[in-house]
């Protein structure tokens, strides 16, 4: 019976460890600045790192600029987006800016896109200052199904701060769906 | 066999509870305003409360102004930093302010510091208004190893809002490293 | 003994699943714009959706404009609040605005309210721009007891963005109290 108990304990420990790891997908994706679109209109950001520096991914997939859910669950999603301008970069087309981020969810089954979270600010970046900076942070708890895709849209992408500590988004699974 | 099963269940329940608690370090540290450094340049904030009001810590250590990781894992890190100025608070020398936060990680083994997250804004705080306020929030999911240290750097520390609901940072472990 | 082991495994799997689900209450509440109070002073927002669109709730209760904790634990709380004004909405009473959010906790036993988190900004929304927008995000990790209530207060509620992706708050349980 002792041996049997040890076996039960062992199999359980194994199962617990395995299920715990399997149950917790995550991703932290950082901006790939080599391919940031220009312009001031709202665009989808498709170039992100998933395996260098702070960027990492597990039990989720990054493909075609989208973070793909592989496992049903409730996830905490977040994004941090930084915009900046220095006078040495040249003049801004306008001093009145709308600096925005939209975290969207796309379902392949129903090919439609929905905004889960948005944030940002209108800004007046006057020429009296040599440097301007602004960051947005959004976060929320959402039910995601396998196959659904998360993507990031921003306005004024040419003003994005390309640092990995500045412009990133991510997700981690918190619990299963009942 | 029933007794044995009860023993298995009991030991498992105990193990599950124990491992669950051990596996989830956390901290929520609030600003200690009695010792905020002066100056406008980027400074490291070293005085935080860990055991009063909303501040708390478990399975992590607070020492020398840094939050020390005691257990390898993936953590969600966050910071909320508020800046404020009232005309009665003191004299501003410039209306143009760079209000920033940097969440940094230091490894003792490799004595180097890296910024995990940054946020903030350039602001124009004119004398036409008697009160000014601005808050920054950042958050992200990071792999942390035992012994690594998390610290907070800000610009314009003398403008920090000293309330516990205003200026704080924290972390909680979400999952083990595979 | 094999049958007994299967029974142990089965009961454990059941217990683990059950306890895991029970241990993780959550809520994501989105603004109900049909009942936003007017004015510019600080008000408590009492109308939120809990079961439509992105809004959802489990093992927590929404009542009288407050999110009620049903289970002791450490929770991550968050809020995203968006303010906006378009010139077609009419003139602003003042160009100098204080756009703020306060996440408060009320204990029924001790009928007092305490602010857990605050964020926001003073803004100068001049008539030179036809559209203004600003978002606040706050988040933090707090110990909550059964029966405690979480509510949201904002300044300038008439400027709130009524979209479900814009103005929301939520919570999810991360771990038990030791």
């Amino acid at each position: 019976i002792r041996a049997e108990k040890a076996m039960v304990d062992g199999s359980w420990l194994d199962l617990a460890k395995r299920s715990k790891l399997e149950a917790q997908p995550f991703a932290h994706l950082t901006i790939n600045a080599t391919d940031i679109p220009s312009g001031s209109h709202k665009v989808s950001l498709s170039s992100w790192y998933h395996d260098r520096g702070w960027a990492k991914i597990s039990n989720m997939t990054f493909s075609n600029g989208k973070l793909i859910v592989n496992q049903d669950g409730f996830y905490y999603l977040y994004a941090n987006i930084c915009f900046r301008h220095h006078e040495t970069s040249g003049d801004l087309a306008t001093e009145y800016l709308q600096l925005m981020v939209y975290v969207t969810k796309t379902s392949i089954k129903i090919p439609s896109s929905h905004t889960l979270m948005k944030g940002g600010s209108t800004k007046y970046w006057s020429g009296n200052s040599e440097f301007h900076f602004y960051s947005i942070n959004v976060g929320g708890f959402f039910k995601l199904r396998s196959g659904e895709e998360i993507s990031i849209e921003v306005s004024n992408p040419s003003l994005l701060d390309p640092d990995q500590d500045a412009t990133y988004f991510g997700a981690f699974k918190v619990r299963d769906i009942d | 066999i029933r007794a044995e099963k009860a023993m298995v269940d009991g030991s498992w329940l105990d193990l599950a509870k124990r491992s669950k608690l051990e596996a989830q370090p956390f901290a929520h540290l609030t600003i200690n305003a009695t010792d905020i450094p002066s100056g406008s340049h980027k400074v490291s904030l070293s005085s935080w409360y860990h055991d009063r009001g909303w501040a708390k810590i478990s399975n992590m250590t607070f020492s020398n102004g840094k939050l020390i990781v005691n257990q390898d894992g993936f953590y969600y890190l966050y910071a909320n930093i508020c800046f404020r100025h009232h005309e009665t608070s003191g004299d501003l020398a410039t209306e143009y302010l760079q209000l920033m936060v940097y969440v940094t990680k230091t490894s003792i083994k490799i004595p180097s510091s890296h910024t995990l997250m940054k946020g903030g804004s350039t602001k124009y705080w004119s004398g036409n208004s008697e009160f000014h306020f601005y808050s920054i929030n950042v958050g992200g999911f990071f792999k942390l190893r035992s012994g690594e240290e998390i610290s907070i750097e800000v610009s314009n520390p003398s403008l920090l809002d000293p309330d516990q609901d205003a200026t704080y940072f924290g972390a909680f472990k979400v999952r083990d490293i595979d | 003994i094999r049958a007994e082991k299967a029974m142990v495994d089965g009961s454990w799997l059941d217990l683990a699943k059950r306890s895991k689900l029970e241990a993780q209450p959550f809520a994501h509440l989105t603004i109900n714009a049909t009942d936003i109070p007017s004015g510019s002073h600080k008000v408590s927002l009492s109308s939120w959706y809990h079961d439509r669109g992105w809004a959802k709730i489990s093992n927590m209760t929404f009542s009288n404009g407050k999110l009620i904790v049903n289970q002791d634990g450490f929770y991550y709380l968050y809020a995203n609040i968006c303010f906006r004004h378009h010139e077609t909405s009419g003139d602003l009473a003042t160009e100098y605005l204080q756009l703020m959010v306060y996440v408060t906790k009320t204990s029924i036993k001790i009928p007092s309210s305490h602010t857990l988190m605050k964020g926001g900004s003073t803004k100068y929304w001049s008539g030179n721009s036809e559209f203004h927008f600003y978002s606040i995000n706050v988040g933090g990790f707090f110990k909550l007891r059964s029966g405690e209530e979480i509510s949201i207060e904002v300044s300038n509620p008439s400027l709130l963005d009524p979209d479900q992706d814009a103005t929301y708050f939520g919570a999810f349980k991360v771990r038990d109290i030791d």
Epitope: - | S38, S40, G90, L92, A93, E95 | -
Partner: antibody, heavy 121, light 107 residues
Amino acid sequence: EVQLVESGGGLVQPGGSLRLSCAASGFTFSRYGMSWVRQAPGKGLEWVSTISSGGSYIYYPDSVKGRFTISRDNSKNTLYLQMNSLRAEDTAVYYCARLDGYNYRWYFDVWGQGTMVTVSS
Amino acid sequence: DIVMTQSPSSLSASVGDRVTITCKASQDVSTAVAWYQQKPGKAPKLLIYSASYRYTGVPDRFSGSGSGTDFTLTISSLQPEDFATYYCQQHYSSPRTFGGGTKVEIK
């Protein structure tokens, strides 16, 4: 080279007025708060006035409040001090100084050579 | 107003000496104290700010310390060009106030 050059000092009768100027060069004037500091003959230093980089914050000690007016013209990189109702105790070398430390904790990091103001009948 | 009391008001020292000047604030000023050097007929020059930070270009023989109400300026090895008057100043709050000065003379 960062430089501040004061001018406009001289002899004035009690009750009279004088306007001091400070020409700045070698740095972006519009991004710095500026001050006037004075030093009576054989005495210590006394802060007289401060103006923020954009000119919307102005500060004086009680000793000169209501009599002195600080101003700036960022397009001309020039700081001014208009002194009215002058008294004998206002006799001093007046220094123009640049502020560093931005917010509440600012100090004076660059000084001009000073201009002498003598109030006497 | 915060009163800054400097001591001594004057001192005599030789080249190579270690010189210490103290400044006492009438109330807590945290670490917001600056030190200036002034030579006859010249403008003051910033040496130290925020109690212990050396300003750009200031030789490392000059150091500052202290917090709260008690502050010290130390010249580790006095050089001929260091004979001057030294002023402390609190930059904690307005009105900005200076100490009365310490004149360092050749012995």
